[in-house]
Interface confidence: low
Amino acid sequence: SERCDDWGLDTMRQIQVFEDEPARIKCPLFEHFLKFNYSTAHSAGLTLIWYWTRQDRDLEEPINFRLPENRISKEKDVLWFRPTLLNDTGNYTCMLRNTTYCSKVAFPLEVVQKDSCFNSPMKLPVHKLYIEYGIQRITCPNVDGYFPSSVKPTITWYMGCYKIQNFNNVIPEGMNLSFLIALISNNGNYTCVVTYPENGRTFHLTRTLTVKVVGSPKNAVPPVIHSPNDHVVYEKEPGEELLIPCTVYFSFLMDSRNEVWWTIDGKKPDDITIDVTINESISHSRTEDETRTQILSIKKVTSEDLKRSYVCHARSAKGEVAKAAKVKQKVPAPRYTVELACGFGAT
């Protein structure tokens, strides 16, 4: 067969769907690989062909579009399952071609089972809500295109196993779930079950997402450097190990990059010749505020090192701060014999 632009197996798009539920899967070629859409391709005389490789098999085979009740069908650039079965799991390929052009991509589709509490191996999207922040809503995800706007589905929301009704601060509003005031106790998995009729059959769509309540931007502050501070002096003799922790608190900020770094005499440690190591540890609060600690370590400090300026810097979307460590050379305790000699010399 003639050459075909093969984009390989697109593992970035690991598609997971629930068993015994409808699934509509768009050919990724038009979304991620090609610069034109399906309509343009179709009007240019290109044909979209689907085939698949079953789980644990190597053989590519055509998809059977002649199953009872049109269980699997194709509509434009969408592959439909009404509904899925467990053994539909495999790698699916869509190929766009005519006599002179060919492009194809494969993607994995996994049909997963869920229990009566909606637990499953499905990777769940995480939706972050700001704590005590006014009304915030989550929307039942990935249900567009399953039924026309003339169809009015019924939507039931669950937290874990429990149907949400008469909850204090959580109100189901159709496709939306409103949190009047988000609290830590609202952390958890939320499931919407959308039920709709189609051609005399009833289908269910189950969508679960994880809600994580995080620090509110109203309470966000610039980074706070707890250490080094004015109360601690790092007093060392040459030859000793110098350890200076830089401990910084960062308020949670959506999409903020938190950074901590040391400078020694105004330069990054990598840019100077002294043998310095830096170890970092990170911890998080329940609302995803972050504490970062970077320990600067010089195994055998010299008297020159003890004269340098050691500054801890921190930056987030709220601002940048810096704090110098107080480092000094320990004055050696006076030695008795030397003192006596000086004494005799003075008389």
Epitope: Y130, E132, G134, L180, A220
Partner: antibody, heavy 120, light 108 residues
Framework: EVQLEESGGRLVQPGTSLRLSCAVS????????MSWVRQAPGKGLEWVST???????AYASWPKGRFTISKTNSKNTLYLQMNSLRAEDTAVYFC??????????????WGQGTLVTVSS | DVQMTQSPSSLSASVGDRVTITCQAS??????LSWYQQKPGQAPKLLIY???DLESGVPSRFSGSGSGTDFTLTISSLQPEDFATYYC??????????FGQGTKVVIK
Amino acid sequence: EVQLEESGGRLVQPGTSLRLSCAVSGFSLSSYDMSWVRQAPGKGLEWVSTIYIGGTTAYASWPKGRFTISKTNSKNTLYLQMNSLRAEDTAVYFCARLQGANYYNSLALWGQGTLVTVSS
Amino acid sequence: DVQMTQSPSSLSASVGDRVTITCQASQSIYSFLSWYQQKPGQAPKLLIYAASDLESGVPSRFSGSGSGTDFTLTISSLQPEDFATYYCQSNYIIDYGAFGQGTKVVIK
């Protein structure tokens, strides 16, 4: 109908105190963040203070402790206590409801305002 | 605190004109910006939130754009009822609340 109605504005002397009220109807004060905004005659809008659902408060830097925002959820009423009033506090004071959605704190619903005049 | 600078402070325009008002923040406020319209003797009215989202009920001739420090309110075709004063407002985190000084749109 959802609405906000301010009251309590009047002519007062410098150095005195005044409490403004904002009666809300059509929604519960316990479900929304609320703000006070003022507008001096012929001037622009100036944010004064906000009280969040949980009762946390925030103020502009200029009142310097003279103003206090509070609310009584059971009465569905928002307040602004203004002490040590000055001539420059003369303004129409609006209460406003924050949008409460999508994390964007826009002032989506406003009262008609109440006029405070500070003059000797 | 964030300072908001609006320009121009006033502009004269005719019905049907395309009108652009700009607002600059003294530091990045991401997309945390609102636009309001105020007519004499009335309370302000929210037009745009989140820099570009149209408040429900607001005509589509109003649009907002920008993020970070530079923002724009555009009225694509000025109508008689649009002659008013327009304000931008920062809604960013602790500093939210700061308004621009206003832009008065008057009939040419």
